[in-house]
Amino acid sequence: RKAVLDCEAMKTNEFPSPCLDSKTKVVMKGQNVSMFCSHKNKSLQITYSLFRRKTHLGTQDGKGEPAIFNLSITEAHESGPYKCKAQVTSCSKYSRDFSFTIVDPVTSPVLNIMVIQTETDRHITLHCLSVNGSLPINYTFFENHVAISPAISKYDREPAEFNLTKKNPGEEEEYRCEAKNRLPNYATYSHPVTMPSTGGDSCPFCLK
C-alpha cells in the first residue's frame, strides 16, 4: 500500500526528479570531484544511485541531505554523462544527464620579444605561446607585474601577439605573459624577460 501511495505521489509533483550537480564542471585528468544528488522532498528516506552511461557507480541512502559521490576523473570516458536515480520503495525518478568537460592544463608559456629601436622609441612585439593545454587559451601580457594587454584568446596553437611602443626608457623593464584556459584557478606564467635600460648598445632583442 505504501508503494502505491509513493507512486501516486510521484504522479503529482510531490516527488519530482532529483537534481545532479557538481561544484566543478571543468576538470583536468586526475582531479577528484564530488557529485551531489539532491531531492526537493526532505522528509522521505530516499535511496540515491549514481550511473555513468550504463554502469552503476554507487548507492547511498539519504533523508533531507544530498547524497555525495566522490570520484576521480582519470580517463576521458569518465567525463560522463552521469545521472542519478532517486528511489522510494518501488518507485524511482532520474535526474537529467550531467557531464564534465575535461581540459588539459596549460603548460608554462614561452615569451619571445622582438624590438625595433629608433632614436626616440622602442617598438616592442611580444609573442606568447603555450605548447600544451586544451584550447582556447587566453594570454595576458604583463610589464613589471602590471597587465598591459587585454586577454587575447587563441583558438589555435599559435602565439598571441601584443605590440607596444615605449619612449626609450631610463630603467629596465620586466615582461612576462600568462596563459589560462577553461580550468578554473589554473594559470601559468612564462619566465620573465628583462629589457635592459637604454644606454650604450644594450638592446639584445633589437633588430638592427
Epitope: S49, F51, R53, K54, T55, H56, K85, S90
Partner: antibody, heavy 119, light 112 residues
Framework: EVQLVESGGGLVQPGGSLRLSCAAS????????ITWVRQAPGKGLEWIGT???????YYSTWAKGRFTISRDNSKNTVYLQMNSLRAEDTAVYYC?????????????WGQGTLVTVSS | AIQMTQSPSSLSARVGDRVTITCQSS????????LSWYQQKPGKAPKLLIY???RLASGVPSRFSGSGSGTQFTLTISSLQPEDFATYYC????????????FGQGTKVEIK
C-alpha cells in the same frame, strides 16, 4: 592482443568448492567490467554476476551467497569462487568483458572452462 | 525475478529469408535501451551483434538490425546467410531491484 582466458574448471563433488580464474591481457581491469556467464549442457546462457571497474559486485539472485566475484588488479585477473556446488551447477563458465561504461555489452569473451559437479 | 522471454524458441528458415526474433521483458530495461543481442554457434563463445537495442557492434554485417524500447525488442536478419544458422540471445540490463542482468532463453535458427 585483447583476450580473456578462463582456468580452474574440472570435476568437483557435490557440496565442494572451486575457484575459477579469468586472466585478462591487453587491457586493464580498472577501466573495464568483467561478467561471469554460464551455460549448462544443451541449455541457454545464464548471467552469474559482474564486477565493474570500481570493484563493485552484482549477482544474480540465485548466485548470491554461494558465488563470489573478486579481482586482483596486480595480476589483472578476476576470480569466481563457487561454494556448496550442486549437480545443476555443471556448465561451461565464461568470463566476458563489457564496453567501457557499459557493464553488459559483452564484446570480448573467454573460451570457457567446464565445471562438472558429480560424485 | 525479472523475466526475459524470447520468442520463438526455435525456427526453421531458408537462406535469403527475413527472420525476426523478439524479446519481451517483464520490466523496462535501464535507460529503455539497455539491451544487447548475441549469436552463439555450437562449442563457441557468444558474439555481440547489437547493443543499445539498435546499434550494430563492430564487424557485424548490416543485415542484422535491432529495434525496440522499454520492454519489447526485436532482432531482424534481413536476408539469412548460411553462416547465420546459430542460436541467438538477448541480454537486458536493469536497475529496478539492484543492478541486474538477464538473458533470454535463446532462439535456435535452423535450416529448413
Amino acid at each position: 592482443e585483447v583476450q580473456l582466458v578462463e582456468s580452474g574448471g574440472g570435476l568437483v563433488q557435490p557440496g565442494g568448492s572451486l575457484r575459477l580464474s579469468c586472466a585478462a591481457s591487453g587491457f586493464s581491469l580498472t577501466i573495464y567490467t568483467i561478467t561471469w556467464v554460464r551455460q549448462a549442457p544443451g541449455k541457454g546462457l545464464e548471467w552469474i554476476g559482474t564486477i565493474n571497474s570500481y570493484g563493485n559486485t552484482y549477482y544474480s539472485t540465485w548466485a548470491k551467497g554461494r558465488f563470489t566475484i573478486s579481482r586482483d588488479n596486480s595480476k589483472n585477473t578476476v576470480y569466481l569462487q563457487m561454494n556448496s556446488l550442486r549437480a545443476e551447477d555443471t556448465a561451461v563458465y565464461y568470463c566476458a568483458r563489457g564496453y567501457v561504461d557499459s557493464d553488459w555489452y559483452l564484446n570480448i569473451w573467454g573460451q570457457g572452462t567446464l565445471v562438472t559437479v558429480s560424485s | 525475478a525479472i523475466q526475459m522471454t524470447q520468442s520463438p524458441s526455435s525456427l526453421s528458415a531458408r537462406v535469403g529469408d527475413r527472420v525476426t526474433i523478439t524479446c519481451q521483458s517483464s520490466e523496462s530495461v535501464y535507460d529503455n535501451n539497455y539491451l544487447s543481442w548475441y549469436q552463439q554457434k555450437p562449442g563457441k563463445a557468444p558474439k555481440l551483434l547489437i547493443y543499445d537495442a539498435s546499434r550494430l557492434a563492430s564487424g557485424v554485417p548490416s543485415r542484422f538490425s535491432g529495434s525496440g524500447s522499454g520492454t519489447q525488442f526485436t532482432l531482424t536478419i534481413s536476408s539469412l546467410q548460411p553462416e547465420d544458422f546459430a542460436t541467438y540471445y538477448c541480454l537486458g540490463g536493469y536497475d529496478s531491484s539492484g543492478w541486474y542482468a538477464a538473458f533470454g532463453q535463446g532462439t535456435k535458427v535452423e535450416i529448413k
